[in-house]
Amino acid sequence: AITEAREEAKPYPLFPGPFPGSLQTDHTPLLSLPHASGYQPALMFSPTQPGRPHTGNVAIPQVTSVESKPLPPLAFKHTVGHIILSEHKGVKFNCSISVPNIYQDTTISWWKDGKELLGAHHAITQFYPDDEVTAIIASFSITSVQRSDNGSYICKMKINNEEIVSDPIYIEVQGLPHFTKQPESMNVTRNTAFNLTCQAVGPPEPVNIFWVQNSSRVNEQPEKSPSVLTVPGLTEMAVFSCEAHNDKGLTVSKGVQINIKAIPSPPTEVSIRNSTAHSILISWVPGFDGYSPFRNCSIQVKEADPLSNGSVMIFNTSALPHLYQIKQLQALANYSIGVSCMNEIGWSAVSPWILASTTEGAPSVAPLNVTVFLNESSDNVDIRWMKPPTKQQDGELVGYRISHVWQSAGISKELLEEVGQNGSRARISVQVHNATCTVRIAAVTRGGVGPFSDPVKIFIPAHGWVDYAPSSTPAPGNADPVLII
């Protein structure tokens, strides 16, 4: 049966009695070898008890003495089998063996849970030589035990290629419960059941769990660890924690907040990032998400003109990146814009409405009745047109852009002329003779350049040809108007 040493027990003597072979307890060792940094493992068995020899792993020496007496089997002496102590306490345990002096270079190594303990442990091996045998005591001490020191420790010795192994010493470090699983924060739907888990371990076991909700115990009598708390549903935020109790006392987990999912708060700080004639780029700062991720957002746009019919345009977009370009708007118009976002629970209220305006638009139609004729005497081309019918939102006409392309054998060049908004005629110098001139005109506002008129072509002859009738914009369906002079 294994003996059990508890921390409350009286300290035991290093040697309860003399070793076999006349070694007395008051003898001082002739040689003491502390293992400082490299070699020897780190734990040592407790008091040596000179009882029956070890029956387990025994080496039978083949050598006999001068008198031809066979040597007894070698084995570690029995020691305490189980040491129970509290965390941060000190412990020392030993294993001992008597080895005939014929053996040289005997070394004891320490092993924990099947792995050799190497490194800077508090391990000391002491040798007590006598006439025939040397008593070897390997001690191991831990100044402040931790849970990680729990385990089974053994001594090993090699003699004659034989391995001698001691009985295990079980070190059980007891302390307050240690949480292996604590409750976690959650966002839950109102009045919907959910589970929280709490698990703590010793030793010592058992560990019992109490649940606490908002500083009140949920269960007045405990549950064995691990414990799952099923909460049938909450209507408001709550904080949960668990207490773990064992024979050493109690510990308390972190408190976790359980939030109730709700509709989000409305977005804030809706702002205009950029405006064009037909689009507005907006951004917003999302409101509180109601403990549930945003799914998407809705941009609501209504004309601010009191004469409008009050209809609302709705544009849906993803919740990220809090940016949206509203398109297909009228130029030079005022709009009210609001943003609403949704999560799994529902839609937020609409943000405060903001006022935004589109800029002027480019003209939507080209100048009409474009005519081109050659004034040979001045070597100019005269161009005339009619002002296009402009809409209010197209903005104020600031002028016209004239494109004239000159093409002759091997030459093609395009020139652009800007003319003011006053009048509806222009004169351009002939650039190339014996060439075709193609003219197009576009109206211009601050909003941009409108569409170009259909091309009108006129042939510019070599010097000395007769000036004929002008070329003009064809009626719809006619072929390209080209006047050959």
């Epitope: 010592p204 606490v212 009598q221 207490e243 064992n246 024979d247 109690l250």
Partner: antibody
Framework: QIQLVQSGPELKKPGETVKISCKAS????????MSWVKQAPGKNLKWMGW????????TYADDFKGRFAFSLETSATTAYLQINNLTNEDSATYFC??????????????WGQGTTLTVSS | DVVMTQTPLTLSVTIGQPASISCKSS???????????LNWLLQRPGQSPKRLMY???KLDSGVPDRFTGSGSGTDFTLKISRVEAEDLGVYYC?????????FGGGTKLEIK
């Protein structure tokens, strides 16, 4: 050695408030709880409830909900029992006892010497 | 609440003689974990209570083995094989299985 030392006897008038202390030594205060037990003259011991010395979470038996409050001064390793709006029925000896839930159930292993409260007009 | 009933109220015993105290509960004290949380306290004259026994029959450290506990369900007994002078005082049983914890009325052990 673990010791629980309670404050001295109290003489109070009905309607007043009393606060009894229980000073712990010899152990880590926050690793256990403290129970309070009432012993009225000629009556049973009556468990009033307990407080977790780490978290301050209290549990009260039904008869002691309302006027009774457990509290802590962790830095002073002291637990308190406060009784408000005292009545004559509160006259009793009040004990504190170290408490937590071990393998044998509620521990109740170390007790204070008791504080005698007399409520009289 | 669980009612704990102790008998007798007073027990007069000669030193060296045995003594027996009964404790009955109004509900079974067998918990769902298989344990029975029935405990005994001793309050010596002028002192605070001291834990004597827990889980029906387990002695607290330092309690002499002349004390034994037995019983199950709702019926429990504390026995002292040979009463000594230091044993006098009031013995209380109490239960920790159900909330709230409740105490018996106490049995006063006096020396004849």
């Amino acid at each position: 050695q673990i010791q629980l030392v309670q404050s001295g006897p109290e003489l109070k008038k009905p309607g007043e408030t009393v606060k009894i202390s229980c000073k712990a030594s010899g152990n880590t205060f926050t690793t256990y709880g403290m129970s309070w037990v009432k012993q009225a003259p000629g009556k049973n011991l009556k468990w009033m409830g307990w407080i977790n010395n780490y978290s301050g979470v209290s549990t009260y038996a039904d008869d002691f909900k309302g006027r009774f409050a457990f509290s802590l001064e962790t830095s002073a390793t002291t637990a308190y029992l406060q009784i408000n709006n005292l009545t004559n029925e509160d006259s009793a000896t009040y004990f504190c006892a170290r408490d937590y839930y071990g393998s044998g159930g509620w521990v109740f292993d170390y007790w204070g010497q008791g504080t005698t409260l007399t409520v009289s007009s | 609440d669980v009612v704990m009933t102790q008998t007798p109220l007073t027990l007069s015993v000669t030193i060296g003689q045995p003594a027996s105290i009964s404790c009955k509960s109004s509900q079974s004290l067998l918990d769902s974990d298989g344990k029975t949380y029935l405990n005994w306290l001793l309050q010596r004259p002028g002192q605070s209570p001291k834990r004597l026994m827990y889980l029906v029959s387990k002695l607290d450290s330092g309690v002499p083995d002349r004390f034994t506990g037995s019983g199950s369900g709702t019926d429990f007994t504390l026995k002292i094989s040979r009463v000594e002078a230091e044993d006098l005082g009031v013995y209380y049983c109490w239960q920790g299985t159900h909330f709230p914890r409740t105490f018996g009325g106490g049995t006063k052990l006096e020396i004849k």
